[in-house]
């Protein structure tokens, strides 16, 4: 009896594992074995496929082939027993644009109120994504054990941080890896469960902002507590990317070492043009807090984004704001000839129930005012260049008392 | 492991153009700071300048208007061109790295140029 | 620019001992300073930088102190492998400027 070829071959590559897939065409013939060729583009002859000879199964695997993975190849099978069957020549593919991304490699720690995320592929020195190690973004959903509500969290790098957990919780997420450049969404990762801390006795201090002032930066934050001593690191950004870095290290900045106010001041000149991470440490010389939320700083944006500056008109039912250029040193206004689109906050002083205009104009009308109430207001400015996409930090609070009622002309 | 080297000419004459090529194995010139730095006969060093991760860079003012320095990320390369060159030139010259702040914590062996008529 | 000061230019000791190299800047660099061994022939490496902070693999004789425009580095129990030239180096303003060095020979 002639045998019959198989059919229905699948070619399934996930990192840097190739595993063949068949039907057999005949199950009622026993002991029938199968075995494939490959060919390279441009070449006439056909080579034996290593690992994938006189197979018994209907899968293979054939990792060990070390090929081009941009190099596009063909492949054909056939059953053999006495005799063998014709060949099936399967669709010629690129192993590269096949491939998938397999689950990365999860590691988690646990603080109070923050889960840091270290995530890495899940094959080492993988030979299909060689050329793109430094390109993986990470997605992740998470969850709170108990509820189920699931959160997702997009475009992260290896090591990452989820903030504003609640202490002693039991959270547990998943991960996939993406190729934005390729197009290419991995598949997920096993589930990891870790359970928060027990809530530290020293919160991480809070609203972290950097601004300009003469040749310096102004690096301050928010503490609960008085008589605490503070320390600030930075991390060049680009190391959050790269997983293996041995060159991945907190570092110190001296003039913010052990200072015993909440705020700190170094030279614009320190650091080398790019994007920093800073984070602040609160201590009491016997605790010591978890570290704050790590914020961005873009030394050649934040040395010419300043803060505007602004005055109000105060009428009963609204306030004018008129908004001008920022000032430098010497007080001498800064000319930022790009275009700025304003935000500005504004709430009752005696609330903190507060309420944002997005206004790319410099006179602004603040509506809805009550008489003879006083309101703050602070504002910053965005680019609206979209590759430039920074925005200052918020100017000082300004407050005002509103005019008595009728005198809104 | 993080590895530069040098390579150059070794002998320039006085107004040539200066070319030195620092090659960095083991680690991308896409991430970080490229530095150069040179140690004249009297062992005084004069840091020269870099070029960074996105390709800014920055000069030292009293090199300003003969220095430059380029980079080929394909070759994980990046370049030094000092033009005019003198006497005063004379020095061995140091590639480096460093990672957001001017201390440098890996460096090449060095190149040595003579400048001489 | 800031100018570094270093001294002495040179010092003889001998194994075991230990001596203290110093550093004088023209202006307060707020401990933003390296300190970097350069023995014959070889490139210079990074001992210390933010003036206290041994860099990764440097062993824990050495050590850097100081504040304002003085600074200095101190190596205990000298080993033979420690002998050869020290600079320091700030870098709180640019361009960043270094020491003249200091020679640490055997006795």
């Known amino acids: 009896k002639n045998l019959k070829s198989p059919q229905k071959v699948e070619v399934d590559i996930i990192d840097d594992n190739f595993i063949l897939r068949w039907n057999r065409s005949d199950e009622s013939v026993g002991n029938v074995t199968f075995s494939f060729d490959y060919q390279k583009t441009g070449m006439d002859n056909w080579i034996k496929l290593s690992g994938c000879q006189n197979i018994t199964s209907t899968k293979c695997n054939f990792s060990s082939l070390k090929l081009n993975v941009y190099e596009e190849i063909k492949l054909r099978i056939r059953a053999e027993k006495e005799n063998t069957s014709s060949w099936y020549e399967v669709d010629s593919f690129t192993p590269f644009r096949k491939a998938q991304i397999g689950p990365p490699e999860v590691h988690l720690e646990a603080e109070d109120k923050a889960i840091v995320i270290h995530i890495s592929p899940g094959t080492k020195d993988s030979v299909m994504w060689a050329l793109d190690g430094l390109s993986f973004t990470y997605s992740l959903v998470i969850w709170k054990n108990s509820s189920g509500v699931e959160e997702r969290i997009e475009n992260i790098y290896s090591r990452h941080k989820i903030y504003k957990l609640s202490p002693e919780t039991t959270y547990c997420l998943k991960v996939k890896a993406a190729l934005l450049t390729s197009w290419k969404i991995g598949v997920y990762s096993p589930v990891h469960c870790i359970k928060t801390t027990v809530e530290n006795e020293l919160p991480p201090p809070e609203n972290i902002e950097v601004s300009v002032q003469n040749q310096n930066y102004v690096l301050k934050w928010d503490y609960t507590y008085a008589n605490m001593t503070f320390q600030v690191q930075w991390l060049h950004a680009f190391l959050k990317r790269n997983p293996g870095n041995h060159l991945y290290k907190w570092k110190q900045i001296p003039d913010c070492e052990n200072v015993k106010t909440t705020q700190c001041v170094f030279p614009q000149n320190v650091f080398q043009k790019g994007i920093y991470l800073l984070r602040v440490q609160a201590s009491d010389g016997n605790n010591t807090s978890f570290w704050s939320e790590e914020i961005k700083f873009d030394t050649e944006i934040q040395a010419f984004l300043l803060p505007p500056v602004f005055n109000i008109r105060s009428l009963s039912d609204s306030f004018h704001i008129y908004i001008g250029a920022p000032k430098q040193s010497g007080n001498t206004p800064v000319i930022q000839d790009y275009p700025l689109i304003y935000e500005i906050i504004f709430w009752e002083n005696t609330s903190n129930a507060e309420r944002k205009i997005i206004e790319k104009k410099t006179d602004v009308t603040v509506p809805n005012l009550k008489p003879l109430t006083v309101y703050c207001v602070k504002a910053r400015a965005h680019t609206m260049d979209e590759k430039l996409n920074k925005s200052s930090v918020f100017s000082d609070a300004v407050c005002e008392k509103t005019k008595p009622g009728n005198t809104s002309k | 492991e993080v590895q530069l080297q040098e390579s150059g000419p070794g002998l320039a004459k006085p107004s040539q153009t200066l070319s030195l090529t620092c090659s960095v194995t083991?680690?991308?010139?896409?991430?970080?700071?490229w530095n150069w730095i040179r140690k004249f006969p009297g062992n005084k060093l004069e840091y020269m300048g870099y070029i960074s991760y996105s390709g800014s860079i920055y000069y030292n003012p009293s090199l300003k208007s003969r220095i430059s320095i380029t980079r080929d990320t394909s070759k994980n390369q990046y370049y030094l061109q000092l033009n005019s060159v003198t006497n005063e030139d004379t020095a061995t010259y140091y590639c480096?790295?460093?990672?957001?702040?001017?201390?440098?914590?890996?460096w090449g062996q060095g190149t040595t140029l003579t400048v001489s008529s | 620019d800031i100018q570094m000061t270093q001294s002495p230019a040179s010092l003889s000791a001998s194994v075991g001992e230990t001596v203290t190299i110093t550093c004088r800047a023209s202006?307060?660099?707020?401990?933003?300073l390296a300190w970097y061994q350069q023995k014959q022939g070889k490139s210079p490496q990074l001992l210390v930088y933010?003036?206290?902070t041994l860099e990764d693999g440097v062993p824990s004789r050495f050590s850097g102190s100081g504040s304002g425009t003085q600074y200095s580095l101190k190596i205990n129990s000298l080993q033979p492998e420690d002998f050869g030239s020290y600079y320091c180096q700030h870098f709180w303003s640019i361009p960043p400027t270094f020491g003249s060095g200091t020679k640490l020979e055997i006795k």
């Open positions: 202006g307060n660099i707020h401990n933003y």
């Open positions: 933010n003036a206290k």
């Open positions: 083991g680690y991308s010139i896409t991430s970080d700071y």
């Open positions: 480096a790295r460093s990672g957001g702040m001017y201390y440098f914590d890996y």
